[in-house]
């Protein structure tokens, strides 16, 4: 007996790791046996070379060759997402549409977010080598190498957190050249080599000498970003100071720094960072768009000298280095609601003054943009006709608009009755795909 098509096996999300073809499965029942066609982001696929897709007789889709690891177009950020694939099974009694399956490709960018820096540590004290691995998909794992060999991590003495290496108690044998290595299925990347010097603690019989040291912090200068640290490095400053008093009793110098609070406000706690220098040194890990106070403190072993004077420096704002998160589109009564969550705080690069929202061309909205001022994280757009509505959102600081979110789309059906929401075992679909062809 004749029956309409029904999807029995839906395609599954997968990561293309190559070098062989990726396969997307789709099986359907129906009488007469249905014909299968595949769509990518709602558009039918050609399957004829030079198309990178090939259809097998059983309805399986072969992706013969992915794009070069990660792809970008129209000036957008590198993407790992090849798109959402759906299959359609059709016979003369109707058409069934599968759930969408997202295909992504393994990527590992070149640029480290934070490169490890040369440093001086003291025997018995803890020190940290910072490393922010390059962005990658899947998330890269981080390992450390010392003097060209993998570092054997000793529990209780070594901890790797977020890529950074924390050494609980420095020993003379820890001296050497360290490198951070990020690895995922797309390959591996090596950081710059950082030189770690270990000094013996010096016990002064008269630590009172340290109290007589006077430190004049003379300059705090914003450094030009190191190109090796990639396109969005955290800011670093160069501190210069002069020491007077007893003959060089200080064994090391520590920078103390904090963000400046509003006048009369409770001061923020001072952060401390051991400096690799005796008259000048680099201090990193700061944030754009902040006003900082800096001072320097001398120390010898456990003894500390008096703090220097305080210098202020305003770091300029930059555009946000991450897009707004969780962008969603929801249908309203003759309107579409766009909502989002601000980018992570560490990517603000200043004060977020508002948001820019774009509608993309070739959908039911003409290309347009709106500015949302202040802390508001939603926008209502009037709609006049059914069709696809696609938007992108970017956060704005005093330096301009930052990285835009990936396009998010919503299909409004006839008479604005409802938005197409394809059920799945994971609840409704994310609204990231254009589903103009998913009408029953």
């Amino acid at each position: 007996q004749d029956s309409p098509p029904q999807i029995l096996v839906h395609p599954q999300d997968q990561l293309f790791q190559g070098p062989g073809p990726a396969r997307m499965s789709c099986q359907a029942s129906g009488q007469p046996p249905p014909t299968i066609r595949w769509l990518l982001n709602g558009q039918p696929l050609s399957m004829v070379p030079p198309d990178p897709h090939h259809l097998l007789p059983d309805g399986t889709l072969l992706l013969l060759q992915p794009p070069a690891r990660g792809h970008a177009h129209d000036g957008q950020a590198l993407s790992t997402d090849l798109g959402v694939y759906t299959c359609e099974a059709s016979n003369r009694l109707g058409t069934a549409v599968s759930r969408g399956a997202r295909l992504s490709v393994a990527v590992l960018r070149e640029d480290f977010q934070i490169q490890p820096r040369d440093m001086v540590a003291v025997v018995g004290e803890q020190f940290t080598l910072e490393c922010g691995p390059p962005w990658g998909h899947p998330e890269p794992t981080v390992s450390w190498w010392k003097d060209g060999k993998p570092l054997a991590l000793q529990p209780g003495r070594h901890t790797v957190s977020g890529g950074s290496l924390l050494m609980a108690r420095a020993e003379k044998s820890d001296e050497g050249t360290y490198m951070c290595v990020a690895t995922n299925s797309a390959g591996h990347r090596e950081s710059r080599a950082a030189r770690v010097s270990i000094q013996e603690p010096q016990d002064y019989t008269e630590p009172v000498e340290l109290l007589a040291v006077r430190i004049q912090l003379e300059n705090v200068t914003l450094l030009n970003p190191d190109p090796a640290e990639g396109p969005k490095p955290r800011p670093a400053v160069w501190l210069s100071w002069k020491v007077s008093g007893p003959a060089a009793p200080a064994q090391s110098y520590t920078a103390l720094f904090r963000t400046q609070t509003a006048p009369g406000g409770q001061g923020a706690p001072w952060a401390e960072e051991l400096l690799a220098g005796w008259q000048s040194a680099e201090l990193g890990g700061l944030h754009w768009g902040q006003d900082y106070e800096f001072k320097v403190r001398p120390s010898s072993g456990r003894a500390r000298g008096p703090d220097s004077n305080v210098l202020l420096l305003r770091l300029p704002e930059k555009v946000p280095s991450a897009p707004p998160q969780e962008v969603t589109l929801k249908p309203g009564n003759g309107t579409v609601f766009v909502s989002w969550v601000p980018p992570p705080a560490e990517n603000h690069n200043g004060i977020i003054r508002g948001y820019q929202v774009w509608s993309l061309g070739n959908t039911s909205l003409p290309p347009a943009n709106w500015t949302v001022v202040g802390e508001q994280t939603q926008l209502e757009i009037a709609t006049h006709m059914p069709g696809s509505y696609c938007v992108q959102v970017a956060a704005v600081t005093g330096a301009g608009a930052g990285e835009p979110s990936r396009p998010v789309c919503l299909l409004l059906e006839q008479a604005m009755e409802r938005a197409t929401q394809e059920p799945s075992e994971h609840g409704p679909w994310t609204l990231e795909q254009l589903r103009a062809t998913l009408k029953r």
């Epitope: 990518l40 696929l45 050609s46 004829v48 030079p50 198309d51 990178p52 060759q65 794009p67 070739n362």
Partner: antibody
């Protein structure tokens, strides 16, 4: 910098042969299709042939089938168009172009073009 | 073979004008359509592929739309450097075919 450079054009008599070369640099040659496209003087663009650097798959326009042969040497990152039995109507500027696939909205574009090489078939 | 028909074959416009060129395929080609710009004596330059995605480095005043058989290239505000000939091309099936071209001239 991604670049394609054609060479080998010139004046040839009807019935004669020429071999055009297209040297690619700045990208992974085997990951892309290369097309030859020609343009007769004062006319529009006409696709001639395509080859896939990865596996050597080829396709031809009916107007050149049996007379032209496309090939590639991946070790030299170079594509070739061997043109035999040339006719007056083959006179044109011949371009080689790299074909890229767009993933957000499926389809191809010839995103990198050579400067073109003129082939004149005349007695 | 899939025939690609462009209209108009030529048009005159002024700097700042909004210009629309259409391309019709003789059968459905999904989004497998590209647009090129060509200036005299130069190789063509890719503007749009996948019907609506701008190629790298192409100004945002160029946009493409359409799917199936009917496609449009729009230049939102014509600039002096935009006077050229524009071609559409399908890659849905062999033979790959181009439209006959649209020449955009200064009024």
């Amino acid at each position: 910098e991604v670049q394609l450079v054609e060479s080998g054009g010139g004046l040839v008599q009807p019935g004669g042969s020429l071999r055009l070369s297209c040297a690619a640099s700045g990208y992974t040659f085997s990951s892309y299709w290369i097309s030859w496209v020609r343009q007769a003087p004062g006319k529009g663009l006409e696709w001639v042939s395509t080859i896939y650097g990865y596996d050597g798959s080829t396709n031809y326009a009916d107007s050149v089938k049996g007379r032209f042969t496309i090939s590639a040497d991946t070790s030299k990152n170079t594509a070739y168009l061997q043109m035999n039995s040339l006719r007056a109507e083959d006179t044109a500027v011949y371009y080689c172009a790299r074909m890229s696939y767009n993933w957000s909205s499926p389809g191809h574009g010839m995103d990198v073009w050579g400067q073109g090489t003129l082939v004149t078939v005349s007695s | 073979d899939i025939q690609m028909t462009q209209s108009p074959s030529s048009l005159s416009a002024s700097v700042g004008d909004r210009v629309t060129i259409t391309c019709r395929a003789s059968q459905s080609i999904s989004s497998y359509l590209a647009w090129y710009q060509q200036k005299p004596g130069k190789a063509p330059k890719l503007l749009i592929y996948g019907a609506s995605s701008r190629a790298s480095g192409v100004p945002s005043r160029f946009s493409g739309s359409g799917s199936g058989t009917d496609f449009t290239l729009t230049i939102s505000s014509l600039q002096p450097e935009d006077f050229a000939t524009y071609y559409c091309q399908q890659s849905w099936s062999y033979p790959l075919t181009f439209g006959q071209g649209t020449k955009v001239e200064i009024k």
